[in-house]
Interface confidence: medium
């Protein structure tokens, strides 16, 4: 099945084309007007990127966040924007690229040892970690080093990939996010901001692992645009 192929990174239902059937089989999904939802089991990954409407960060790729495209713009019109690199200004963690977090309005590296102690409060009780800092205004509550081992295992609740253990990323699964395995070579991956395909990925995949990039599978080059399959491939 798709699940086993994707090693727990299933996207069973990718968003339909604009105007296509919406709704997850056996469920009712609703949201802000104008946003369509996952329908059939079709891969709809296209290289021709277009702005991707969104209502919250989880709809966007791991290297994107959801915001108004213009400063002080209409809050009702939001799209997925490229994440902000190190030392760029930010307002919340999701704005910063993977491996970084928002500290004092600037994206800084989360590789430093003190990161987890700085932004976590009392964390070890449920699933994995429970943050108080999603709004990007972290409380400086330094914890002892014994807290650093609390990174979430596969299936743990998470808010950011830095919450998860090595080899895992934080990806959307229905209405929450959990730690899932980073994709390996040959596994199906997702290109975000599909042209004419606006919707929430309720099963979000992780990104490709180190040394890999998400590219069209070679034998799929001749396929029609709507069925091009992307896989994690060596650079």
């Amino acid at each position: 099945t798709l699940n086993s192929v994707l090693n727990s990174n299933a996207i069973k239902n990718l968003p339909p084309p604009l105007g296509g059937a919406a709704g997850h089989p056996g469920s009712a999904v609703s949201a802000a007007p104008g946003i369509l939802y996952p329908g059939g089991n079709k891969y709809q990954t296209i290289d021709n990127y277009q702005p991707y409407p969104c209502a919250e960060d989880e709809e966007c790729g791991t290297d994107e966040y959801c915001a108004s495209p213009t400063r002080g713009g209409d809050a009702g019109v939001q799209i997925c924007l490229a994440c902000r690199k190190r030392r760029k200004r930010c307002m919340r963690h999701a704005m910063c690229c993977p491996g970084n977090y928002c500290k004092n309005g600037i994206c800084v590296s989360s590789d430093q040892n003190h990161f987890r102690g700085e932004i976590e409060e009392t964390i070890t009780e449920s699933f994995g970690n429970d943050h108080s800092t999603l709004d990007g205004y972290s409380r400086r509550t330094t914890l002892s080093s014994k807290m650093y081992h609390t990174k979430g295992q596969e299936g743990s609740v998470c808010l950011r990939s830095s919450d998860c253990a090595s080899g895992l990323c934080c990806a959307r699964h229905f209405w929450s996010k959990i730690c899932k395995p980073v994709l390996k070579e040959g596994q199906v991956c997702t290109k975000h901001r599909r042209k004419g395909s606006h919707g929430l990925e309720i099963f979000q995949r992780c990104y490709c692992g180190e040394g890999l990039s998400c590219r069209i599978q070679k034998d799929h080059h001749q396929a029609s645009n709507s069925s091009r399959l992307h896989t994690c491939q060596r650079h």
Epitope: S8, A10, G26, A32, E56, F127, D130, T133, G155
Partner: antibody, heavy 114, light 107 residues
């Protein structure tokens, strides 16, 4: 610690309405998806509905679709379940739960009977 | 909908016994499976998440295994407080579904 407290249950006639509330504390409420799960007397567990952290996305079981509405007020750390057109088969203890049911409330009993 | 079938429906065991409960999904659910314990008049309590991860605060005598369609909850040495009903639940797809429950009674 994480705490979820349901309220609003009671006796209601078939066709009637009821609104359940779930007050959350001990965690950053807006960061977590939430669920409602019910358990009919002497029976097993049934997932009813789920909602994303921002409240933008809602999900329902077929048995309640079109009759129940899940919502949340993050400023009040409160989850809601508006239940309309109630039927006898909706009689159950209703639990609110965090995320994929890692923490549960104590439940509130809803009885639909004439 | 994905059907979750637990077996046995009930079992009688003694303190110190090793107890195994199985749960079968009607289709592949990867490792998106929880195990719960429920005592009379109480809310369910999460024991195992992601098929095999022990929830914080849960005694190590509880363990979970399996992936795909077949899963197992094992209690290595049954304690008096373990007599309860146990449920499996899949969160691979909506609607999320539970097994019918396994009642563990005192022999």
């Amino acid at each position: 610690q994480v705490q979820l407290v349901e309220s609003g249950g009671g006796l209601v006639q078939p066709g009637g309405s009821l609104r359940l509330s779930c007050a959350a504390s001990g965690f950053t409420f807006s960061s977590y998806g939430m669920s409602w799960v019910r358990q009919a007397p002497g029976k097993g567990l049934e997932w009813v509905s789920g909602i994303s952290g921002s409240g933008s996305y809602t999900y329902y079981a077929d048995s309640v679709k079109g009759r129940f509405t899940i919502s949340r007020d993050n400023s009040k750390n409160t989850l809601y379940l508006q239940m309309n057109s109630l039927r006898a088969e909706d009689t159950a203890v209703y639990y609110c739960a965090r995320h994929y049911m890692d923490h549960w409330g104590q439940g509130t009993l809803v009885t639909v009977s004439s | 909908d994905i059907q979750m079938t637990q077996s046995p429906s009930s079992l009688s065991a003694s303190v110190g016994d090793r107890v195994t409960i199985t749960c079968r999904a009607s289709q592949d659910i990867s490792n998106y499976l929880h195990w719960y314990q429920q005592k009379p008049g109480k809310a369910p309590k999460l024991l195992i998440y992601g098929a095999s991860n022990l929830q914080s605060g849960v005694p190590s005598r509880f363990s979970g295994s399996g992936s795909g369609t077949d899963f197992t909850l094992t209690i290595s040495s049954l304690q008096p407080e373990d007599f309860a009903v146990y449920y499996c639940q899949q969160y691979d797809s909506i609607p999320m579904t539970f097994g019918q429950g396994t009642k563990v009674e005192i022999k």
